[in-house]
Interface confidence: medium
């Protein structure tokens, strides 16, 4: 079976003009998934991103996340890239205040 992930992108304010953007994938199966941040379409280097492990979410499916810090005002340059079971999608950082974007493939 294949269950596509829900993708949720959030921003949280941090100091000195930087914000943390977090991309969460949840409710997917099987466990193998690709999740990475891209800037202007290019994947960020590994050492600028922080990942959570892929863990059960209690419903027979899985969840994970990836986060990175970016300059406030440059949100539109960043997207979260997701690949799962042959499907893939790109999810933008929400503009404006601390918002959440949720999408279902």
């Amino acid at each position: 079976r294949t269950v596509p992930p829900m993708v949720n992108v959030t921003c949280s304010e941090v100091s000195e003009g930087n914000i943390t953007v977090t991309c969460r994938a949840s409710s997917f199966y099987p466990r193998n998934i690709t999740l990475t941040w891209r800037q202007d379409g290019v994947s960020l280097s590994h050492n600028t991103q922080q990942w959570g492990d892929v863990l059960p979410d209690g419903n027979g499916t899985y969840q994970t996340w990836v986060a990175t810090r970016i300059r406030q005002g440059e949100e539109q340059r960043f997207t979260c890239y997701m690949e799962h079971s042959g499907n893939h999608g790109t999810h933008p950082v929400p503009s404006g205040k601390v918002l959440a974007l949720q999408s279902q493939w």
């Epitope: 193998n32 999740l35 990475t36 492990d53 863990l55």
Partner: antibody, heavy 119, light 108 residues
């Protein structure tokens, strides 16, 4: 720094169980999973299986009837048990960390331990 | 099971030359899940390139990777003496997570 160290008996008799431990430092067992891989002398690499941070396991179907991978977080150790061994199980056995964001690549390896199966 | 076939089995080159190593998968592999490892005699493998084209930490930029689908390539632009080793491709696209049989890069 990140380190993994395999240990266990270097000689195992046919039909017995091979038991190895992988002691890790420099990272948390609750944050990273571990793979076990083996390499017969003069040959290539073979993936045995892995354990995720929640303790669930994925095994190579070629070993599934006789392999067990587990974790003891209190000792910072992962373990591999392979039952009913034969001479074909003679190999260098490696543990390797499952990297985050490396899409399950193995980003740090132990130095390996040679296990010989012989009577 | 996805079978990875590496070619050539042995590659004999001199320092300073360019090396091109090939990895062909028996069925399509996501580029995210195709990795390369380097192994020197008596040592454990080390991660060289992850996700087809990304250099692992501490790997010099004379190494590069490319490819998609079933055909992947590892290139070393200018061989240094320490590059002579065995190279393995590895897929984590579908269990069991297989390795190629290796390409031995030796000094000519």
């Amino acid at each position: 720094q990140v380190q993994l160290q395999e240990s266990g008996p270097g000689l195992v008799k046919p039909s017995e169980t091979l038991s190895l431990t992988c002691t890790v430092s420099g990272f948390s067992l609750t944050t990273y999973g571990v793979h076990w891989i083996r390499q017969p002398p003069g040959k290539g690499l073979e993936w045995i299986g892995m354990i995720w941070t929640d303790g669930t396991t994925d095994y190579n179907a070629a070993f599934i009837s006789r392999v067990t991978i587990s974790v003891d977080t209190s000792k910072n150790q992962f373990s591999l048990k392979l039952s009913s061994v034969t001479a074909a199980d003679t190999a260098v056995y490696y543990c390797a960390r499952k990297g985050h964001g490396y899409y399950y690549a193995m980003d740090y390896w132990g130095q390996g331990t040679l296990v010989t199966v012989s009577s | 099971e996805i079978v990875l076939t590496q070619s050539p089995g042995t590659l004999s080159l001199s320092p300073g030359e360019r090396a091109t190593l090939s990895c062909t998968a028996s069925s399509s592999v996501s580029s995210s899940y195709l990795h390369w490892y380097q192994q020197k005699p008596g040592q454990a493998p080390r991660l060289l390139i992850y996700s087809t084209s990304n250099l692992a930490s501490g790997i010099p930029d004379r190494f590069s990777g490319s490819g998609s689908g079933t055909d992947f390539t590892l290139t070393i632009s200018r061989l240094e003496p320490e590059d002579f080793a065995v190279y393995y491709c590895h897929q984590y696209h579908r269990s069991p997570f297989t390795f190629g049989q290796g390409t031995k890069l030796e000094i000519k």
